[in-house]
């Protein structure tokens, strides 16, 4: 799903407060809820009719350093007979989300948001046809 | 999936430099790649074997305000025929991800990281069966 | 030239299995779904299923399901239909034919101009006890 | 599933007159359609795609029209070699393709 625009005024201060200096923010250390845990039915990747593969990139200067991404295994989806069936195609969910970028020179370590598009898995649905002139 | 505990070691400074004060960092105005968008197909949610509907949740001080959850219609899976099939199951797809809480008091706005559990969207699985004697 | 050149005539006993092959040549092979439909003598066309030559994924017309087996071979750029469990109906011509569809994601797309325009020149099974 | 369903079965005709065919399908199938002609021992071979595009290297004289659920195939000024027996096909349920049932075209 989509991460609307900032439009930046979400980091803005009220109007009638003077305006952050340097273009930069005060963010606190620490993470809300850091101990909140992804609770999905286990090798779901697997036992999927439209089953994943994960790929893992990992980034020093990004939080979280591990991003995890799915590739689809198939272009159909897999049938009661455990046969990839094309008359239902297995397609890619995904999800915008927020990482952390750091940038650092010297002792003057700052950070940035970043918006990175995460496939999450995927699922099997009646395809959609076109047909070209 | 998961995001690691920071272990705060992401957000210090090297060692041999000064420490933050006050247990804060600089935060940059902007995000990097913000015009990214998802490019899922269209209405998958719908055409989906374990097709779900998706609820809106709005918090202004949140960024983004905006966080979509989906959840499954279905116990079981929609077959050729259009019925539900309990053989097969629907399962969410879940995902980790970061948004940005905003605390203010006056003029004074800091910002911290927030874990939010997101449902992505829902698979059809086979599902695994538990004997309990 | 364009063309999908089909293996020969068969003759089987009821029960026993045939495998048919159907080698493209002149265009691309990857690029082409290929499907399968055969003709009982005197009648008309009927569709048995489609295979998509990337993943070698495959789709089946219901009737057909448990006894067809649709593999293809990149390397020789041919596709293969194995009828197995045969009875006196399965006696009939069976052509291969091309599909120029795309699909990725959800989402086909179909080029008419070049869609079902090129079939083999079928090959004939005789079921016989 | 989509059915297709087309008429006559059989007609005779002589050469020089106007036949047409038509194909009725089941349910809208927009311009899914494509038109085929078929001689005894051979495979079929495409006159018309898109319900109205004639095939390059298919005489004029063929044409076809319609869309959604009504289809024609028209020859106008019947020729020997045109004896043969007709087909419609429907594309538009993927991967499924469903023909008509044939029509036959005898010299009268």
């Known amino acids: 799903r989509k991460i609307p625009k900032v439009g930046h005024t979400f980091f803005q201060k009220p109007e009638s407060c003077p305006p952050v200096p340097g273009g930069s923010m005060k963010l606190d250390i620490g993470i809300i809820n850091e101990n909140q845990r992804v609770s999905m039915s286990r090798n779901i990747e697997s036992r999927s009719t439209s089953p994943w593969n994960y790929t893992v990139t990992w980034d020093p200067n990004r939080y979280p350093s591990e991003v995890v991404q799915a590739q689809c295994r198939n272009l159909g989806c897999i049938n009661a007979q455990g046969k990839e069936d094309i008359s239902m195609n297995s397609v890619p969910i995904q999800q915008e989300t927020l990482v952390v970028r750091r940038k650092h020179q010297g002792c003057s370590v700052s950070f940035q948001l970043e918006k990175v598009l995460v496939t999450v898995g995927c699922t099997c649905v009646t395809p959609v046809i076109h047909h070209v002139q | 999936r998961k995001i690691p505990k920071v272990g705060h070691t992401f957000f210090q400074k090297p060692e041999s430099c000064p420490p933050v004060p006050g247990g804060s960092m600089k935060l940059d105005i902007g995000i990097i790649n913000e015009n990214q968008r998802v490019s899922m197909s269209r209405n998958i949610e719908s055409r989906s074997t374990s097709p779900w509907n998706y609820t809106v949740t709005w918090d202004p001080n949140r960024y983004p305000s905006e966080v979509v959850q989906a959840q499954c219609r279905n116990l079981g899976c929609i077959n050729a025929q259009g019925k539900e099939d309990i053989s097969m199951n629907s399962v969410p797809i879940q995902q980790e991800t970061l948004v940005v809480r905003r605390k203010h008091q006056g003029c004074s706005v800091s910002f911290q990281l927030e874990k939010v559990l997101v449902t992505v969207g829902c698979t059809c699985v086979t599902p695994v069966i538990h004997h309990v004697q | 030239q364009v063309q999908l050149v089909q293996s020969g005539a068969e003759v089987a006993k009821p029960g026993a299995s045939v495998r048919l092959s159907c080698k493209a040549s002149g265009f691309s092979f990857i690029k082409y779904y290929m499907h399968w439909v055969r003709q009982a003598p005197g009648q008309g066309l009927e569709w048995m299923g489609v295979i998509e030559p990337t993943g070698g994924g495959t789709s089946s017309a219901q009737k057909f399901r448990d006894r067809v087996t649709l593999s293809r071979d990149t390397s020789t750029a041919t596709v293969h239909l194995e009828v197995s469990r045969l009875t006196l109906e399965d006696t009939g011509i069976y052509f291969c034919?091309?599909?120029?569809?795309?699909?990725?994601?959800?989402?086909?797309?179909?080029?008419?101009?070049?869609?079902?325009?090129?079939w083999g020149q079928g090959t004939a099974v005789t079921v016989s006890s | 599933d989509i059915q297709m369903t087309q008429s006559p079965s059989s007609l005779s005709a002589s050469v020089g007159d106007r036949v047409t065919i038509t194909c009725r399908s089941s349910?809208?199938?927009?311009?899914?359609l494509a038109w085929y002609q078929q001689k005894p021992g051979k495979a079929p071979e495409r006159l018309i795609y898109a319900a109205s595009n004639l095939q390059s290297g298919v005489p004029s004289r063929f044409s076809g029209s319609g869309s959604g659920t009504e289809f024609s195939l028209t020859i106008s000024g019947l020729q020997p070699e045109d004896f043969a027996t007709y087909y419609c096909l429907q594309h538009n349920s993927y991967p499924l393709l469903t023909f008509g049932g044939g029509t036959k075209v005898e010299i009268k």
């Open positions: 034919v091309r599909d120029s569809i795309y699909c990725k994601h959800g989402t086909c797309h179909r080029t008419v101009i070049d869609a079902f325009d090129i």
């Open positions: 349910q809208d199938i927009k311009n899914d």
